[in-house]
């Protein structure tokens, strides 16, 4: 007799989702043997690198890559040695590079290169850093949400595969520069460029998806700031008891906030702002990010942009789920529904910032941005996308799913590394003995 | 020119309550500002106390929360200090000082920074009998 | 309450030396991307004086010989050549949660 190796029992990927604010880095794990099963990858643990995003090294590309080491490091502790050369590595950027390559295409080329250059000395099988589409970003969100959940395919007890008869959920992701909408349609799409055509399972699905640039949390805020320095003298959305500085040119330098800027400015100018808490000038603020005077389609959301109605279920994740988590949580109030929601947002507006701390204590200067984060949610959802009561009864605000963290960064590797086969595995399962 | 000075009794008896008062030169303490104290045990790091903002709002450190009161006269532009029942152990130098939020820039993202950039010379306060 | 630890308690240099500070939080510090810490400088009978702020960023005035870096829990405050003025006491400060904390100091005396 002979000893015969039995094939490892798991493989790993990995994927570093460099976001507006910062990165995370993912290890995903799946059973070798059921890699076409749906579910069945998970998240084997994650890491923040710590300090901002990549796009804020545009100054100092080589710090990009330097702070990726820490996490990177974790990466060859969490992944045994064994796999690390069989492990595929993947960095997707998001719209805070989509934002730098808008305003310094070389600087962009100069971070991605940088961490490329840092990814590389790992013993993982590196595939690639590149700046993912806006599209890109919601159709992956899309289908992490629906492989956790188990919406594309199911087991049956007799070793057969078999469609669900659920629907898919539309995933709904609030970023830091961006947010996208993705879901299920049944009709074709007006604007071809919001249509993704999709075989998974040997099942087709038509997927409406849009990403707004400057929507993301991060820059809505920035947006309201420079719209608060231009029509008040104080901020609205900020509460009362709340003052800052602002030196001009930290206002005005994104890209989202061109509109807002002045034809002449100071930029090195401090302004000193104070917060109002007042609900009602900070709805009109908020509502004045979204246009809805032209819309060349049957049907829009916002700015022109077409949109069929939304259907089905929905998963809200990211800075969605941490803003009405701090509703839920933090603050003790009920947002079940539409109503309900915006009577939270109102609430949180009108608490002084004195109210804000001691209703949460140990917090700092985030607690500030709750109010205008709350009432952004809220209008983006009711008028924005177009949720009336009966259909935001079908939205759920959850961050993970099968203890996986929701997002793009599942369903890029999914994709990349042909987890999800477009055809259903053609025999049932059993077990090789060759 | 901004400019802070605190003023009070430099001994103090255990049990009593300890009183400085600040007083600010050169900007309104109604201004946009929060008024903070600061204290410095001998030979030991700083603890911030509590502070009174433009806006009137207190913010104490819970670790003294039910000893400490800031208040303020505005037409003095002058805000103070008064800690309670005292003991040896709130022997220290005091330091009154303006802080803000200062606005910063981030990877796309903004945020607030609490900075306290103007300060006064220090009073030292000896708790004794 | 969030706890800084800074070392060492006390550094001797030389005039042209590197100074290098260390400052350890119990827990991150870090929001979103953003460092919420601040370094002070004190002299002997003086008010303390802001130096750093955000982690990195230089308060106007304050010479280029300083910098600051580092994030989640760990920070450090380099002096790249010390001068004669720079001998002083400096201190770290979080303003991440609150209370605010400062760090226990650590004296930059001469060699």
């Known amino acids: 007799t002979r000893d015969i190796r039995e094939p490892p029992a798991l493989k790993y990927g990995i994927v570093l989702d460099a976001g507006s604010s910062h990165t995370s880095m993912f290890i995903y794990k799946w059973p070798a043997d059921k890699e076409n099963d749906t579910g069945i990858v998970g998240q084997h643990s994650s890491c923040d690198v710590p300090g901002g995003g990549i796009s804020s090294y545009a100054d100092n590309p080589s710090g990009a890559g330097q702070s990726l080491v820490g996490c990177l490091e974790q990466a060859l502790r969490d992944v045994p040695k064994e796999r690390h050369a069989g492990t595929p590595l993947y960095l997707g950027a998001t719209a805070g590079m989509r934002l730098l390559n808008l305003t310094n295409p070389e600087a962009s080329t100069s971070v991605l290169t940088a961490v490329t250059h840092t990814l590389t000395q790992y013993p993982f099988d590196f595939r690639g850093a590149r700046i993912l589409s806006g599209q890109e970003e919601g159709v992956f969100g899309w289908v992490t949400a629906n492989y956790l959940l188990e919406n594309f395919i199911k087991y049956g007890w007799v070793g057969r595969w078999f469609r669900p008869r659920k629907g898919t959920l539309g995933a709904m992701d609030l970023g830091g520069a961006s947010t996208q909408i993705t879901f299920e349609t049944t009709s074709p799409a007006e604007d071809r460029a919001s249509e993704v055509q999709l075989r998974l399972y040997g099942q087709h699905y038509r997927v409406y998806t849009h990403s707004f640039l400057c929507y993301g949390r991060d820059q809505v805020l920035q947006r309201l700031l420079a719209s608060a320095l231009q029509t008040h003298s104080f901020h609205p959305c900020w509460p009362r008891g709340f003052s800052t500085h602002v030196l001009l040119g930290d206002v005005y330098q994104s890209p989202c906030t061109v509109a807002q800027r002045p034809q002449t400015f100071n930029s090195s100018a401090r302004v000193s702002l104070s917060g109002s808490s007042d609900p009602h000038l900070c709805r009109d603020l908020v509502s004045g990010l979204f246009s809805f005077s032209s819309c060349p389609f049957s049907r829009c959301s916002f700015n022109g942009v077409f949109q069929p109605p939304v259907a089905g279920n929905f998963i809200a994740f990211s800075a969605f789920f941490y803003t009405v988590n701090f509703l839920r949580t933090s603050m003790g109030l009920p947002v079940a529904t539409l109503q309900q929601l915006e009577a939270a947002a109102v609430n949180v507006c009108n608490q002084t910032w004195a109210q804000l701390q001691a209703r949460v204590p140990g917090q700092q200067a985030h607690l500030a941005d709750y109010c205008a984060g709350a009432m952004f949610v809220q209008q983006l959802l009711s008028r924005g996308y177009g949720f009336d009561e009966r259909a935001f009864g079908g939205v759920i605000f959850q961050k993970k799913a099968a203890d996986t963290a929701v997002g793009w960064a599942l369903g890029y590797m999914l994709n990349l590394t042909n987890l999800i086969p477009a055809d259903p595995p053609g025999l049932r399962k059993g077990t090789d003995f060759s | 020119q901004v400019q802070l000075q605190e003023s009070g009794p430099g001994l103090v008896k255990p049990s009593q309550t300890l009183s400085l008062t600040c007083t600010v030169s050169?900007?309104?303490?109604?201004?946009?500002?929060?008024w903070n104290w600061i204290r410095q045990h001998p030979g030991k790091g700083l603890e911030w106390m509590g502070y009174i903002s433009y806006d009137a709002d207190n913010n104490y450190n819970p670790s003294l929360k039910n000893r400490i009161t800031i208040s303020r006269d505005t037409s003095k532009n002058q805000f103070s200090l008064k800690l309670s029942s005292v003991t040896a152990a709130d022997t220290a130098v005091y330091y009154c000082?303006?802080?803000?939020?200062?606005?910063?820039?981030?990877?796309?993202?903004?945020?607030?920074?609490?900075?306290?950039?103007?300060w006064g010379q220090g009073t030292t306060v000896t708790v004794s009998s | 309450d969030t706890q800084m630890t800074q070392s060492p308690s006390s550094l001797s240099v030389s005039v042209g030396d590197r100074a290098t500070i260390t400052c350890k939080a119990s827990?991150?510090?870090?929001?979103?991307?953003?460092?919420?810490m601040n370094w002070y400088q004190q002299k002997p009978g003086k008010a303390p004086k802001l130096l750093i702020y955000?982690?990195?960023n230089l308060e106007s005035g304050v010479p280029s010989r300083f910098s600051g870096s580092g994030s989640g829990t760990d920070f450090t405050l380099t002096i790249s050549s010390v001068q004669p003025e720079d001998f002083a006491t400096y201190y770290c400060q979080q303003s991440n949660e609150d209370p605010p904390t400062f760090g226990g100091g650590t004296k930059l005396e001469i060699k």
């Open positions: 827990q991150s510090v870090d929001y979103e991307g953003h460092s919420y």
């Open positions: 050169g900007y309104s303490i109604t201004s946009g500002y929060y």
């Open positions: 000082a303006g802080g803000y939020y200062r606005y910063g820039l981030g990877s796309y993202s903004g945020s607030y920074y609490y900075v306290m950039d103007y």
């Open positions: 955000a982690a990195s």
